[in-house]
C-alpha cells in the first residue's frame, strides 16, 4: 500500500476517506488504528458499531469519529480540533475474525500555519498511468504491514 | 548545514553497469526524498526518480524505470543509484538533489543538490 | 508527462538592465490542493542548479529581491530587475505537480 498523506490545520476538523471494494469486504467491520513506533502495532483508535447492518452509525473515541458507507464502499474517519499530536501513520482496516486487512495507509499532517489552511483534508490518489499528480507530501509507503517494516513518520 | 557529497568521476565501458553514491549531511536524511537528475553535455536536465530513505519507497521516470535503481542507507545516510546496461548516452553528469521538507508555505522543490558525478561511457 | 518550453534559448542583455524569460507547460500545473508547483533554478558554468523560485513567485533563501517569479496555469515568468555579472548562467524551470517531475530546456542569459 502506498501512504496517502492528509494534511489538516491545527484546531479545525480532518475527514480522512478510505475508499475499499464494497463486495469484497461485505459484512466486514472496519476499524481506524494509529501505528505505534518504527516497527510497533498498530493500536486500535475506533471501530464500527458491532452490529455490520448499523456501520453507518458515527462511532465516537474521544475527538476521532468513525461511519462507513458499506453500499458504497467508503470508510470516513473524522479527527475533530485536529492537534499537533495527532501526526502520525495510521491505517484504515477491515476486519475478519483475528485478521485485519489493510484498507489504507494514512500520514497525518497537522499544519500550524493557518495561511496554508488551503491545504487542509486534500487528498490526492496517484493514479495508475505513467503521469501522475504528485502527493505532496514529505514521504509516502509501499511496504506491508506484514512485512513489519512501517517506520514512524518524522515529528520535525 | 545541508551537504551532498557525490562519488567521483567514473569512465566505464558500454554494457557495463555502475554505482553512484550520494552522502547527506546536515539533515534528516531518511524523512526527506532523494532525487537523481540526469544532464548530459551541454543538455538540459532529465529527472531519473527519487526515493524516500525512510522506507525505500521509489518512483521513477518511465524512461530510466528499467535501468536505474534507486537505493538508500540509512545508518550511512547515503543514496545510491545503480545503472545498467550502459551506452554512449549515459554519458552524462547524474545529480542527487534533496526535495525541500513539506513545510506549509515551501514545499516541493529541490532545494539542495550534489556537485554531480560525472559520468563517461566508452570502449 | 508534462512538457515545459521555455523561451527564449539565449538571452543577451546588458548589467543593469531587466531580463525576462518565459515558461510554458502543456498542461496546468495547479495541483488538486490548489498551490501551483512551478520553480527557478539558475546553473552557473560548472557548477550545479540552485533554487532561486519554489511554488511561482516564492524566494528561495538568499536570493536576492532582483528575482520574481509570476504566472498562473500553464504561463510562468522569471524577472531579474537589475542583471548582475554573477547572475549570468543558464536558468531552469520546472514542475512538481505530477510524477514525473519536469524541466524545462533552459535559457542561457549572457551579456549582450
Known amino acids: 500500500h502506498n501512504t496517502t498523506v492528509f494534511q489538516g490545520v491545527a484546531g479545525q476538523s480532518l475527514q480522512v476517506s478510505c475508499p475499499y471494494d464494497s463486495m469484497k469486504h461485505w459484512a466486514r467491520r472496519k476499524a481506524w488504528c494509529r501505528q505505534l513506533g518504527e516497527k510497533g502495532p498498530c493500536q486500535r483508535v475506533v471501530s464500527t458499531h458491532n452490529l455490520w447492518l448499523l456501520s453507518f452509525l458515527r462511532r465516537w473515541n474521544g475527538s476521532t469519529a468513525i461511519t462507513d458507507d458499506t453500499l458504497g464502499g467508503t470508510l470516513t474517519i473524522t479527527l475533530r480540533n485536529l492537534q499537533p499530536h495527532d501526526a502520525g501513520l495510521y491505517q484504515c482496516q477491515s476486519l475478519h475474525g483475528s485478521e485485519a486487512d489493510t484498507l489504507r495507509k494514512v500520514l497525518v499532517e497537522v499544519l500550524a500555519d493557518p495561511l496554508d489552511h488551503r491545504d487542509a483534508g486534500d487528498l490526492w490518489f496517484p493514479g495508475e498511468s505513467e503521469s501522475f499528480e504528485d502527493a505532496h507530501v514529505e514521504h509516502s509507503i509501499s511496504r506491508s504491514l506484514l512485512e513489519g517494516e512501517i517506520p514512524f513518520p518524522p515529528t520535525s | 548545514q545541508v551537504q551532498l557529497q557525490q562519488s567521483g568521476p567514473e569512465l566505464v565501458k558500454p554494457g557495463a553497469s555502475l554505482k553512484i553514491s550520494c552522502k547527506a549531511s546536515?539533515?534528516?536524511?531518511?524523512?526527506?526524498?532523494m532525487n537523481w537528475v540526469k544532464q548530459r553535455p551541454g543538455k538540459g536536465l532529465e529527472w531519473i526518480g527519487r526515493?524516500?530513505?525512510?522506507?525505500?519507497?521509489?518512483n521513477y521516470n518511465g524512461e530510466f524505470r528499467v535501468r536505474a535503481t534507486l537505493t538508500a542507507d540509512t545508518s550511512s545516510t547515503t543514496a545510491y543509484m545503480q545503472l545498467s546496461s550502459l551506452t554512449s548516452e549515459d554519458s552524462a553528469v547524474y545529480f542527487c538533489?534533496?526535495?525541500?521538507?513539506?513545510?506549509?508555505?515551501?514545499?516541493?522543490?529541490?532545494?539542495?543538490w550534489g556537485q554531480g558525478a560525472s559520468v563517461t561511457v566508452s570502449s | 508527462d508534462v512538457v515545459m518550453t521555455q523561451t527564449p534559448l539565449s538571452l543577451p542583455v546588458s548589467l543593469g538592465d531587466q531580463a525576462s524569460i518565459s515558461c510554458r507547460s502543456s498542461?496546468?500545473?495547479?495541483?488538486?490542493?490548489?498551490?501551483?508547483?512551478l520553480h527557478w533554478y539558475l546553473q552557473k558554468p560548472g557548477q550545479s542548479p540552485k533554487l532561486l523560485i519554489y511554488?511561482?513567485?516564492n524566494r528561495f533563501s538568499g536570493v536576492p529581491d532582483r528575482f520574481s517569479g509570476s504566472g498562473s496555469g500553464t504561463d510562468f515568468t522569471l524577472k531579474i530587475s537589475r542583471v548582475e555579472a554573477d547572475d549570468l548562467g543558464v536558468y531552469f524551470c520546472?514542475?512538481?505537480?505530477?510524477?514525473?517531475?519536469?524541466f524545462g530546456g533552459g535559457t542561457k542569459l549572457e551579456i549582450k
Open positions: 520546472s514542475q512538481s505537480t505530477r510524477v514525473p517531475y519536469t
Open positions: 546536515g539533515y534528516a536524511f531518511s524523512s526527506s526524498w
Open positions: 511554488k511561482v513567485s
Open positions: 498542461q496546468s500545473l495547479v495541483h488538486s490542493n490548489g498551490y501551483t508547483y
Open positions: 538533489a534533496r526535495l525541500l521538507r513539506n513545510q506549509p508555505g515551501e514545499s516541493y522543490a529541490m532545494d539542495y
Open positions: 526515493i524516500y530513505p525512510g522506507d525505500g519507497d521509489t
